[in-house]
Structure formats: structure tokens, C-alpha cells
């Protein structure tokens, strides 16, 4: 048993049929010695008397708020949550496996630049009675500070018969140098509580590996005289790290016809302009990627050819 | 990434082209190592991230873009221990910090070159003959060092009398390649920045 926060404790249980459970000793936080009784939740049934109460925790019915009283007055209380371990593996019932980039990916994180700011998100099909708390650090043995906000519900989607809820959190490394070479990864830890069930999820990454620039901005077309060619120009996204001559991007320019089956023409360039042939009803799209470290491409910025 | 490779203008900052080749070569070598050593801990998640230049050079600090010198977090350990001049320096305009920066890059390359050569000598003794260092990568390191043209004593190749542990050597190769790739990214950024300035 360990303390999650003031008066809230997590009991770790091996979860299998007829498991013996865990013996837990609760102590009433009071100088009183006599006349102390214990109850669970709203029930008036007395579970025991004395300054300590020993219980066998086996199932969710044994979790909840244990309260010690004296003469009708509440002295203290302890809320017990359960953390299930099945076949030696901690349960992951609360969050959905996103399976990207690999199986057992429950948390996904992205950064728009090298400032030390990043966003993580996760999915669940549970709509209520859910609490998340997020902590993060750089490294784990001698952790350096990363500050995370509160997790918020950022999207709701319907998937078949199920509704899916996306939660996200923004974190910022306390003292980040955009030019630094990372040798210790960022660790993100999410505590999830659904009713009286506790679970925890972790992710470890380098900012450089989760970079995904915003799409290029101000995408414009300039027709070239007496030609089907156009000059496409764009700019670095505002959110990208500066100076741009140090944090350089590379770009992919694509000409795509109306039908998905039509052949796509692609050009790669380090410049912020390119000359392409604009077909009728086609659209021109540009996306960006760090020029020197191949993390994710940005989403496409697009303009119609006409 | 299959990008069309642009050939630099002759008037262009001469080290930029070499640094681009360096990053390409080390990235290819790392990819080859990951594939060949698939049953070894060779991915970024599996290895310990060590920097053999730590406390010996200060490339990130010495080569910090002017715009980032206002950032307190970037100024933790600015050292000014390298004073020299080399052929990549753009004539008289070269600042003291730029000389320091390029000299630090040169020292990095020299240290990695020694490590890689020592390691290659060990790998050549492996009866499995599983992996060797790409000669192109070693040549590219050499070319960039020559372009930087700093005079410094040659460091003798480390030789060891004990029987090499090939498993450990291969893991160390992965660690070195990961670290060198990160440094090659920094070097490329620096050259791009200096070229633009």
C-alpha cells in the first residue's frame, strides 16, 4: 500500500480467481485511544474498533473510504483504491492502446519545436468518474523539472457503437535550450483513476524524436507567363524554432489531382519556393520536416490550382 | 530520405557541403548497424546515451547562434578554451567565437575518428565478420577535418592487448553512432547558420 495523495492510498493486488488479496492495516489519525469505531463509505455498519483496523482487501467492494469515528464525530479517513496486477502485468483497462507507433502505446506526445514544450494525449472509452494527473521530468535518477498543466478533454469521437474520448496535457521543460543535445529522455507519468480503480501509464522520449512542425504558412501560387507552370511559395510556420538558418526545415511539394487514384507529382526542396506544373482541378500541398533530423512530417498546407 | 542533392556553389561556405555528407554517411551507417545488429540493443530506446566529447569539447555552447545567447538555459557552461584559425573561416570577419566553434567541431571529429578506427580494428578481428565501419563515413570525417584545416597533434590510435569482447564492441558501436549522429546534426545546423550569416 502506498499514498497517492493526502488520505488516498493505492492497494496493489494480484488479480486472479480466489486470490487471497492483501492485508491492510489502517491507523486512525488521532491522539484518541479509546472508543474508536470504523465504517466504510456511507454504511453505518461497524467494521471494527480501536485505533487500527486490519482488513483483507480482495475486490472493489473492499475499496472505498474507511472512516474512524468517536461519539458520532469523524476523526480521520482513508480512501483505498485498487491497482490490479494480472499475470504479473499491471492492468491497462482505463486507456486505449493507440497501437501507433507500436503496440502498447497508450500515451502519444508531439512537439512543434525545440523549445521544451510538448503535448501528450491519450484515448479512453470511459466517459465519467475519471481523473488524470500528469507528472513529468527530464531523466529519472536525478530528475530535472518539467511542468505539466491539467489534463483536459480535448475531443470526442464516435467509433462504431462506441464513443471515444481524447484527453491531452501540455508540458514545458523548466529550463530548456533549443540547441541542446539531449542525452536524458523526458519521462511522462500519468495516474489514471476510474471510480476506485488506479492505473499508471508512462512514456519516455527525446524531444528531437517527437518533433512535428506545424504546416508551412502563407502558401501562395504565382502563375508563370505563357506556361502551365506556377511558382509555389510558402513560409516557415510561426511556431518553428528560430533562427531558421540554424533550425532549418526541408519541404515536400505535391501536386494531386481531384481523384485519389491520379498520379501524385512530388518535389523535395530546402527552399521556400518551387516551380511545378498545375493541372486543372488539381491542388498543391506542401509539408515540412526538420532538415537534419528526420522526425515526423507536418500536416499538409494546401491550395487549389485554379 | 531520397532527396535530390544540391551541389553547393563554389563560393559557398566550404564546410557546409562536407557537413551534409557527414550527416548522410553517419545516418546510413546507423541504419545499417540497426539492421545488422537487430538482436543487439541498438535502438535509441535501448542504448545508454553517452557523449565521448563531454567535458572535452563544448561544441553546442561554442557554436550557439547569436539569437540563443539571450536564453539563460543555453548559457550554463560556455567555455572559451579553443583559440585557433582554419580555412573554413570567412576571412577577417571571423569572430573569436566562430574560431572557437569550428575548432571545437574539429576536436569532436578527431575524437570520433580515433574511436571509430580503434573499433573497426576490433571488428575486423571478429570471426563472425558481422559489421564493419563504412569506409565512406571515415573518409567523410577526414574530408571535413581537412576542410576545417586546424593544426593539431595527431592522436595515436588506441591499441589494446586484451582479447576484444565483440558483443560489447558492437553495443559500443551503436552508442557511438547514435551520439555521433546527434553531433553531426548539430554540426550541420552550425554550418547552415554560418553559411547564412
Amino acid at each position: 500500500i502506498w499514498e497517492l495523495k493526502k488520505d488516498v492510498y493505492v492497494v496493489e493486488l494480484d488479480w486472479y480467481p480466489d486470490a487471497p488479496g492483501e492485508m491492510v492495516v489502517l491507523t486512525c489519525d488521532t491522539p484518541e485511544e479509546d472508543g474508536i469505531t470504523w465504517t466504510l463509505d456511507q454504511s453505518s455498519e461497524v467494521l471494527g474498533s480501536g485505533k487500527t483496523l486490519t482488513i483483507q482487501v480482495k475486490e472493489f467492494g473492499d475499496a472505498g473510504q474507511y472512516t474512524c469515528h468517536k461519539g458520532g464525530e469523524v476523526l480521520s479517513h482513508s480512501l483505498l483504491l485498487l491497482h490490479k496486477k494480472e499475470d504479473g502485468i499491471w492492468s491497462t483497462d482505463i486507456l486505449k492502446d493507440q497501437k501507433e507507433p507500436k503496440n502498447k502505446t497508450f500515451l502519444r506526445c508531439e512537439a512543434k519545436n525545440y523549445s521544451g514544450r510538448f503535448t501528450c494525449w491519450w484515448l479512453t472509452t470511459i466517459s465519467t468518474d475519471l481523473t488524470f494527473s500528469v507528472k513529468s521530468s527530464r531523466g529519472s535518477s536525478d530528475p530535472q523539472g518539467v511542468t505539466c498543466g491539467a489534463a483536459t478533454l480535448s475531443a470526442e469521437r464516435v467509433r462504431g457503437d462506441n464513443k471515444e474520448y481524447e484527453y491531452s496535457v501540455e508540458c514545458q521543460e523548466d529550463s530548456a535550450c533549443p540547441a541542446a543535445e539531449e542525452s536524458l529522455p523526458i519521462e511522462v507519468m500519468v495516474d489514471a483513476v476510474h471510480k476506485l480503480k488506479y492505473e499508471n501509464y508512462t512514456s519516455s522520449f527525446f524531444i528531437r524524436d517527437i518533433i512535428k512542425p506545424d504546416p508551412p504558412k502563407n502558401l501562395q501560387l504565382k502563375p508563370l507567363k505563357n506556361s502551365r507552370q506556377v511558382e509555389v511559395s510558402w513560409e516557415y510556420p510561426d511556431t518553428w524554432s528560430t533562427p531558421h538558418s540554424y533550425f532549418s526545415l526541408t519541404f515536400c511539394v505535391q501536386v494531386q489531382g481531384k481523384s485519389k487514384r491520379e498520379k501524385k507529382d512530388r518535389v523535395f526542396t530546402d527552399k521556400t519556393s518551387a516551380t511545378v506544373i498545375c493541372r486543372k482541378n488539381a491542388s498543391i500541398s506542401v509539408r515540412a520536416q526538420d532538415r537534419y533530423y528526420s522526425s515526423s512530417w507536418s500536416e499538409w498546407a494546401s491550395v487549389p490550382c485554379s | 530520405r531520397n532527396l535530390p542533392v544540391a551541389t553547393p556553389d563554389p563560393g559557398m561556405f566550404p564546410c557546409l557541403h562536407h557537413s551534409q555528407n557527414l550527416l548522410r554517411a553517419v545516418s546510413n551507417m546507423l541504419q545499417k548497424a540497426r539492421q545488422t545488429l537487430e538482436f543487439y540493443p541498438c535502438t535509441s530506446e535501448e542504448i545508454d546515451h553517452e557523449d565521448i566529447t563531454k567535458d572535452k569539447t563544448s561544441t553546442v555552447e561554442a557554436c550557439l547562434p547569436l539569437e540563443l545567447t539571450k536564453n539563460e538555459s543555453c548559457l550554463n557552461s560556455r567555455e572559451t578554451s579553443f583559440i585557433t584559425n582554419g580555412s573554413c573561416l570567412a576571412s577577417r570577419k571571423t569572430s573569436f567565437m566562430m574560431a572557437l566553434c569550428l575548432s571545437s567541431i574539429y576536436e569532436d571529429l578527431k575524437m570520433y575518428q580515433v574511436e571509430f578506427k580503434t573499433m573497426n580494428a576490433k571488428l575486423l578481428m571478429d570471426p563472425k565478420r558481422q559489421i564493419f565501419l563504412d569506409q565512406n563515413m571515415l573518409a567523410v570525417i577526414d574530408e571535413l577535418m581537412q576542410a576545417l584545416n586546424f593544426n593539431s597533434e595527431t592522436v595515436p590510435q588506441k591499441s589494446s592487448l586484451e582479447e576484444p569482447d565483440f558483443y560489447k564492441t558492437k553495443i559500443k558501436l551503436c552508442i557511438l553512432l547514435h551520439a555521433f549522429r546527434i553531433r553531426a546534426v548539430t554540426i550541420d545546423r552550425v554550418m547552415s547558420y554560418l553559411n547564412a550569416s
Partner: nanobody, 119 residues
Framework: EVQLVESGGGLVHPGGSLRLSCVAS????????MGWYRQAPGKQRELVAS???????NYADSVKGRFTVSRDNVKGTVSLQMNSLKPEDTAVYYC?????????????WGQGTQVTVSS
């Protein structure tokens, strides 16, 4: 049978305070997030504040810093302390467990308690 009984409403001047209370019975109270909702005439019912099983609280932007939600798992009560009240806080206030509404698919709503903020 699930029962929710709200009390504590009344007429108060702008800037004044009220404390609402809700007694819940007929279900196991502790695991559920409990919420306070309000409905002004001609408007949709909105969630004002909630408190989870582990006492994490959430507030609508319009009441942040003025309202405080708390719970007592022994008595099965949830309270809403409302300070610096404004005329736009005028509404009928209800308490409920969002999870209970979701699970049972039934609308368990109490009679609510009227709060009127007027000079």
C-alpha cells in the same frame, strides 16, 4: 432507489454567498464523481462544478475562483459554496452523478434548489 435532495438555495444580493447541499442515497456514493448543475430559464442545463472519487475538482470558467465544491463520503453529501454571487448565477441548481446517468440511462434528478441573485 436513487434519491438526490438539494437544499440551501434562496434570494441573495449580488456579492453575497450561499451554501448548497445535496444528500444522495440509493447507490454507492464514494466511487462516483459528483457534480452540481444549473438551469436558468430558457437555457440548457450546464455543469457548474464536479468532484471526483479522489477529490479532484473541476469548475466551469464562469464560476472559477468563486465556487468551491466538496464532498462527504460518510454522509453521502456534496456541497457547493458560492461566493461573490452575480445576477447571471440565477438558476435552479441540481446535484447528480454523471456516471450514474450514463450507466443507468435514467434521468435521476432531484427537485433542485432555486438560487436568485438580485438587488
Amino acid at each position: 432507489e436513487v434519491q438526490l435532495v438539494e437544499s440551501g438555495g434562496g434570494l441573495v444580493h449580488p456579492g453575497g454567498s450561499l451554501r448548497l447541499s445535496c444528500v444522495a442515497s440509493g447507490f454507492r456514493f464514494t466511487p462516483y464523481t459528483m457534480g452540481w448543475y444549473r438551469q436558468a430559464p430558457g437555457k440548457q442545463r450546464e455543469l457548474v462544478a464536479s468532484i471526483s472519487s479522489v477529490y479532484s475538482t473541476n469548475y466551469a470558467d464562469s464560476v472559477k475562483g468563486r465556487f468551491t465544491v466538496s464532498r462527504d463520503n460518510v454522509k453521502g453529501t456534496v456541497s457547493l459554496q458560492m461566493n461573490s454571487l452575480k445576477p447571471e448565477d440565477t438558476a435552479v441548481y441540481y446535484c447528480n452523478a454523471p456516471g450514474l446517468l450514463h450507466e443507468e440511462g435514467t434521468d435521476y434528478w432531484g427537485q433542485g434548489t432555486q438560487v436568485t441573485v438580485s438587488s
